[in-house]
């Protein structure tokens, strides 16, 4: 079998809402993946599991099941949304995200995604991790790749 390539493209959109009294930020983050099937037979994308971290804390998780199949030597672009909540120990971010004196309220989030594919009863998992900028101060639609957080700026693991 040839490889199945998973490429995390980036954040497509981020829709934000706030709970004023509980100083909570709700961010619905839609991400885009490219999955390429380099084989001469179809493969099933069985599930996508994703999580988002802020300051080493998981703030959102999502799982998509029975997503699609990808034909031989074909590629599919898949969008998936992770609902995230920034609250409680991180409620200090509420002030930053709602501060009207600044235009862009970028925060750095770590996107983690695992794609499970199956073919002929065989299962394969491919994972990706990427740091991304997301504006927590307004609803934003991004050009693909626009929200990328440069590797040189990534904190050491």
């Amino acid at each position: 079998p040839r490889s199945i390539d998973v490429k995390y493209i980036g954040v497509k959109s981020a829709y934000v809402s706030y709970d004023v009294q509980k100083r909570t930020i709700y961010l619905n983050i839609t991400n885009t993946l490219n999955i390429t099937n380099n084989n001469y037979y179809s493969v099933e994308v069985e599930n996508i599991t994703a999580q988002v971290q802020f300051a080493k804390t998981v703030i959102g998780k999502a799982r998509l099941n029975n997503i699609t199949h990808i034909g031989p030597l074909d590629m599919k672009q898949i969008d998936y949304t992770v609902p995230t909540v920034i609250a409680e120990e991180m409620s200090y971010m509420y002030d930053f995200c709602t501060l009207i004196s600044i235009k862009v309220h970028n925060i750095v989030l770590m996107m983690q995604v695992t794609v499970t594919t199956t073919y002929f009863g065989h299962s394969e998992q491919i994972s990706q991790e990427r740091y991304q900028y997301v504006d927590c101060g307004r609803n934003t639609t991004y050009q693909l790749g626009q929200s990328e957080y440069l590797n040189v700026l990534q904190p050491q693991q």
Epitope: S17, Y18, D19, V20, Q21, K22, Y26, E88, I100
Partner: antibody, heavy 121, light 112 residues
Framework: QVQLQQSGAELAKPGASVKLSCKAS????????MHWVKQRPGQGLEWIGY????????KNNQKFKDKVTLTADKSSSTAYMQLSSLTYEDSAVYYC??????????????WGTGTTVTVSS | DIVMTQAAPSVPVTPGESVSISCRSS???????????SYWFLQRPGQSPQLLIY???NLASGVPDRFSGSGSGTAFTLRISRVEAEDVGVYYC?????????FGGGTKLEIK
């Protein structure tokens, strides 16, 4: 129907600790934050803090940060407030209050019966 | 901390008449989302407080429509029309916008 049943009156000596309870019934305990409010005899109301029963996260009024410990037990749907190093100023009625509502529209919709704490030597 | 001030410690009223109880906040409770986070509670003698008004002007469930709330960002009024004997007690305003949440000192409604 939604109810908050608080523990009985406490008589304690200065320097001692007491643990008050607030048992919730008639709703999903983990869905709403539980707040605590103090009322000294013949005086007004003072917000102490809250516990989120779902996560255990608490936030206290700075005035009470060294005085009060808030906890919640999901299995018994009970919120607790421990008062430590009691002084005469801690003599008061303590209420638990559920914060009902929805996003950006929260309010103290249900109050407990109140627990009287008397500090006396 | 936001200070809530109820200037009148008590207000006397005759049953059947109307009465207004006022409260001021040291900071505006009007949020940019359009909501004003002021609240009114009644504590009857020997009882726990009960919610009357939330977000300045919204009547809480089960509260008679004789009660109404109004105001601006920093000045709030609770109005009771056709006062009844069961309305006696202490009325507290509260701000539910910023920690620590704070209450006014209370206004006692007394029947003449």
């Amino acid at each position: 129907q939604v109810q908050l049943q608080q523990s009985g009156a406490e008589l304690a000596k200065p320097g001692a600790s007491v643990k008050l309870s607030c048992k919730a019934s008639g709703y999903t305990f983990t869905s709403y934050w539980m707040h605590w409010v103090k009322q000294r005899p013949g005086q007004g109301l003072e917000w102490i803090g809250y516990v989120n029963p779902s996560s255990g996260y608490t936030k206290n009024n700075q005035k009470f940060k060294d005085k009060v410990t808030l906890t919640a037990d999901k299995s018994s749907s009970t919120a607790y407030m421990q008062l430590s190093s009691l002084t005469y100023e801690d003599s008061a009625v303590y209420y638990c209050a559920r914060e009902g509502g929805s996003i950006s529209d929260w309010y103290f919709d249900v109050w407990g019966t109140g627990t009287t704490v008397t500090v006396s030597s | 901390d936001i200070v809530m001030t109820q200037a009148a410690p008590s207000v006397p009223v005759t049953p059947g008449e109307s009465v207004s109880i006022s409260c001021r906040s040291s900071k505006s409770l009007l949020h940019s989302n359009g909501n004003t986070y002021s609240y009114w509670f009644l504590q009857r003698p020997g009882q726990s407080p009960q919610l009357l008004i939330y977000r300045m002007s919204n009547l809480a469930s089960g509260v008679p429509d004789r009660f109404s709330g109004s105001g601006s960002g920093t000045a709030f009024t609770l109005r009771i029309s056709r006062v009844e004997a069961e309305d006696v007690g202490v009325y507290y305003c509260m701000q539910h916008l910023e920690y620590p949440y704070t209450f006014g000192g209370g206004t006692k409604l007394e029947i003449k």
